[in-house]
Amino acid sequence: FKVATPYSLYVCPEGQNVTLTCRLLGPVDKGHDVTFYKTWYRSSRGEVQTCSERRPIRNLTFQDLHLHHGGHQAANTSHDLAQRHGLESASDHHGNFSITMRNLTLLDSGLYCCLVVEIRHHHSEHRVHGAMELQVQTGKDAPSNCVVYPSSSQESENITAHHHHHHH
C-alpha cells in the first residue's frame, strides 16, 4: 500500500481552521491479522529523508494523535486531550485520514507528516508517510480563506466551503 497526499501545500489566514488529509492507496488487507496504526506529527525537510524527525503538533506527540484499527475502519483520536489543543484526527472507511487544526496561528506554519504503519501478524512492520506544508499568513497578503495546492499539479483550490473561521 501507499500513502497519497492530495495537497502538498495549504496556505491559510490566521484564525482559520484547516483539515490536512492523507489517503491510503492500494490493496488494503481487511483480514484479522492486519491492523493499521495512523498518526500525525510535525517534521522538517531533512537532507536525507523528509518526515524522519518526529516533533509535536501543539505540544501533542505522535503518540497522542494516533488512530489504531483494522483495515478501512473509521476511528477518531481521544477527543478530550486533542480538542483542548484545537486538534482532532480522524479516519473514514475509504482510507482517508486527516487532522483538523482549529484557530490557526503563525506558529502552526511548517511541515506536517502523516504516518501509517501496517502491522501484519508475524511479519515486519511496513511504514509509509506523506508530507505537506502549512503556511499560515497574516496581514494584507494573507488569503481570506485557505487555499490548497494539489500535489500533482500547480492548480490551486479555494477550500472556503469546507473550512470555517473558529468562533469563540
Epitope: 524522519s52 503518540q63 494516533h66 489504531h68 515486519s124
Partner: antibody, heavy 118, light 107 residues
Framework: QVQLVESGGGLVKPGGSLRLSCAAS????????MSWIRQAPGKGLEWVSY????????YYADSVKGRFTISRDNAKNSLYLQMNSLRAEDTAVYYC???????????WGRGTLVTVSS | EIVLTQSPATLSLSPGERATLSCRAS??????LAWYQQKPGQAPRLLIY???NRATGIPARFSASGSGTDFTLTISSLEPEDFAVYYC?????????FGQGTKVEIK
C-alpha cells in the same frame, strides 16, 4: 507522573514458576503496545515478549516460547509475564517497556530481579 | 534473526574527547535502528530513533548516522554523565534484537 513499575521478582528453583507484574501510570496504557526485556547480570539486553494494545498479536523470543506467557489488563493499567519451567539462564533483571508500531522503547521500568537457582 | 555487532566493546576516553561507536547489522534494517544509553543500576534510555534523530531531551552533542547495515553514534565532546553503556537495537524484523553494547569508560 509517567512511569512503569515492575514487581514479582525473587529467588526461585529451576523448574519453578513466577509471575511478574508491571504497573503503568501517567499515560493511556490501553493505547500502547508493551514488551518485556531482560538483562542477565553483567550482560546485554534481550527482548523477551511483546503484546499489542488490544492483547493480540503476541510475540515471544525463541528462548522463552512455550514457557512464558505475556498478558495485560487495560482496566488495571497492568502488564504481566507468567514464567514457567524456569531455568538458570532465565536469571536476569526483567524490564517492562512501552512500545508502539513504528517506534522504539521510549519508557522503561526500573526492573525486577529474577534469580533461578537451586 | 538479525544480529547486531557493536564495536569496540570498550572505549576508554577522557571528558571532552570525541566518542565514535559502531553498530553493524547482519542484514539490512533500513533506518529502523535506535540507540540507548544505560548507566549502572538504571534502565536504558532512548537516545536516538530511526538511525539519526535525537529523542526528546537528548543533548545536541549526541548525533548518529547510517542506514542499511552500518550505523554510527557520535558523542562530540564527552561530559562526565556520558560514561555509560550504549546499545543499538533494530525493529525492522522479529525478533527485536539489541547489540551486545559498548562501554564508554573514563580513561
Amino acid at each position: 507522573q509517567v512511569q512503569l513499575v515492575e514487581s514479582g521478582g525473587g529467588l526461585v528453583k529451576p523448574g519453578g514458576s513466577l509471575r511478574l507484574s508491571c504497573a503503568a501510570s501517567g499515560f493511556t496504557f490501553s493505547d500502547y503496545y508493551m514488551s518485556w526485556i531482560r538483562q542477565a547480570p553483567g550482560k546485554g539486553l534481550e527482548w523477551v515478549s511483546y503484546i499489542s494494545n488490544s492483547g493480540s498479536p503476541i510475540y515471544y523470543a525463541d528462548s522463552v516460547k512455550g514457557r512464558f506467557t505475556i498478558s495485560r489488563d487495560n482496566a488495571k493499567n497492568s502488564l504481566y509475564l507468567q514464567m514457567n519451567s524456569l531455568r538458570a539462564e532465565d536469571t536476569a533483571v526483567y524490564y517492562c517497556a512501552r512500545d508502539l508500531p513504528g517506534w522504539y522503547f521510549d519508557l522503561w521500568g526500573r526492573g525486577t530481579l529474577v534469580t533461578v537457582s537451586s | 534473526e538479525i544480529v547486531l555487532t557493536q564495536s569496540p566493546a570498550t572505549l576508554s576516553l577522557s571528558p571532552g574527547e570525541r566518542a565514535t561507536l559502531s553498530c553493524r547489522a547482519s542484514q539490512s534494517v533500513s533506518s529502523y535502528l535506535a540507540w540507548y544509553q544505560q548507566k549502572p543500576g538504571q534502565a536504558p534510555r532512548l537516545l536516538i530513533y530511526d538511525a539519526s534523530n535525537r529523542a526528546t531531551g537528548i543533548p545536541a552533542r549526541f548525533s548518529a548516522s547510517g542506514s542499511g547495515t552500518d550505523f554510527t553514534l557520535t558523542i562530540s565532546s564527552l561530559e562526565p554523565e556520558d560514561f555509560a553503556v550504549y546499545y543499538c537495537q533494530q525493529r525492522n524484523n522479529w525478533p527485536r534484537t539489541f547489540g551486545q553494547g559498548t562501554k564508554v569508560e573514563i580513561k
